[in-house]
């Protein structure tokens, strides 16, 4: 499969509550978007007759507690992991380790967060410490979207940590965002 999911399970502290649409996309930059060497993505066939809306990415809900050192949220939050197929499978290799990748020449569609929501959480700390109030930003929905320069530079910044690791005989390609990004979830507190 040449289509990479985003492992969006990071929760970050934000300054204000509200709904957060994705920042406006910048103009596409084919140089950064489509090259296989950019992040180690294999090339793929361009979309021709199929509309991206015909493909469906998955919104997988997980329940977890927000932590900050020894402190833990009183109630769990629901996180969404965006994952799934945003391109025509028939144009991808028909077996892991077999087939061949098409030359890159079209837009790259990925299953990424579409909207975010903010949630206030109360963190309970051991040792009689006073509870802390925090606001966290959580993924609210996912969508198959055209990868833009904005995504390439910000959303993809964690990509490539394992880019050199070939999988099951495929060409080297990045694993999606490491869930380790969670560890920074409360380091961005304002």
């Amino acid at each position: 499969q040449g289509w990479q999911a985003f492992k969006n399970d990071a929760t970050e502290i934000i300054p204000e509550l509200g709904e957060y649409p994705e920042p406006p996309p910048e103009l596409e930059n084919n140089k950064t978007m489509n090259r296989a060497e950019n992040g180690g993505r294999p090339p793929h066939h361009p979309f021709e007759t199929k509309d991206v809306s015909e493909y469906s990415c998955r919104e997988l809900h997980f329940t977890r507690y927000v932590t900050d050192g020894p402190c833990r949220s009183a109630k769990p939050v629901t996180e969404l992991v965006c994952s799934g197929q945003c391109g025509p499978a028939r144009l991808l290799p028909n077996a892991i380790g077999r087939g061949k990748w098409w030359r890159p020449s079209g837009p790259d569609f990925r299953c990424i967060p579409d909207r975010y929501r903010a949630q206030r959480v109360q963190l309970l700390c051991p040792g009689g410490e006073a509870p802390r109030a925090r606001k966290v930003r959580l993924v609210a929905s996912c969508k198959c979207k055209r990868l833009t320069r904005f995504h390439n530079q910000s959303e993809l910044k964690d990509f490539g940590t394992e880019a050199a690791r070939p999988q099951k005989g495929r060409k080297p390609r990045p694993r999606a965002r490491s869930a380790k990004a969670n560890q920074a979830e409360l380091e961005n507190a304002y």
Epitope: E79, Q85, I96, R175
Partner: antibody, heavy 120, light 107 residues
Framework: QVQLQQSGAELVRPGTSVKVSCKAS????????IEWVKQRPGQGLEWIGA????????NYNERFKGKATLSADKSSSTAYMQLSSLTSDDSAVYFC?????????????WGQGTSVTVSS | DIQMTQTTSSLSASLGDRVTIRCRAS??????LNWYQQKPDGPVKLLIY???TLTSGVPSRFSGSGSGTDYSLTISNLDQEDIATYFC?????????FGSGTKLEIK
């Protein structure tokens, strides 16, 4: 190579608890979900739930809420499933499996299974 | 929850036959349909994912197809080593669900 090594068979008393482990090796543990699946003798497969080891996030099949508790230890790349208040209905083989959610959207590697027998 | 139905619980066929196992979902699962093979008292193995993609080492006599709610697994030239139980599974949304399985036997 990718391996999921499960703990050995368990013979336990009704009303007690058991904790099954699944040690992952050969891949980045936090980059894949671990799913748990139940199979009663001669029966089909039943999805219990999933854990995202990177965040500790879980999702349970409604039927197993209160019965199964999933956890993961990143430092040892091991996932755990605790089953509580055991009854004869819990006698089964329990599998852990890795879900490659960035590429395959399926459980691409499975543990060998852990047999849990609940008997007085 | 999405129900997965494998209407045939067991299937007898001769070596060399073309065998098709069907699976139906209670709602559209957008091709997130996987097939697993389990040999008697053995582990579970992923055969096909995302409807039609074979995993490494799976013989090319296996193929998968379908869309929407109806999916199938075909073995084009049945071999002795294909004797097993086959399960379909939807990976579209939690809770993931499996079909009840189809046991393949030799006539």
């Amino acid at each position: 190579q990718v391996q999921l090594q499960q703990s050995g068979a368990e013979l336990v008393r009704p009303g007690t608890s058991v904790k099954v482990s699944c040690k992952a090796s050969g891949y980045a543990f936090t980059n894949y979900f671990i799913e748990w699946v139940k199979q009663r003798p001669g029966q089909g497969l039943e999805w219990i739930g999933a854990i995202n080891p990177g965040s500790g996030g879980t999702n349970y099949n409604e039927r197993f809420k209160g019965k199964a508790t999933l956890s993961a230890d990143k430092s040892s790349s091991t996932a755990y499933m605790q089953l509580s208040s055991l009854t004869s209905d819990d006698s089964a083989v329990y599998f852990c499996a890795r879900e490659d959610y960035g590429d395959v959207y399926a459980m691409d590697y499975w543990g060998q299974g852990t047999s849990v027998t609940v008997s007085s | 929850d999405i129900q997965m139905t494998q209407t045939t619980s067991s299937l007898s066929a001769s070596l060399g036959d073309r065998v098709t196992i069907r699976c139906r979902a209670s709602q559209d699962i957008s091709n997130y349909l996987n097939w697993y093979q389990q040999k008697p008292d053995g582990p579970v193995k992923l055969l096909i994912y995302y409807t039609s993609t074979l995993t490494s080492g799976v013989p090319s006599r296996f193929s998968g197809s379908g869309s929407g709610t109806d999916y199938s697994l075909t073995i084009s030239n049945l071999d002795q080593e294909d004797i097993a139980t086959y399960f379909c599974q939807q990976g579209k949304t939690f809770p993931f669900t499996f079909g009840s399985g189809t046991k393949l036997e030799i006539k």
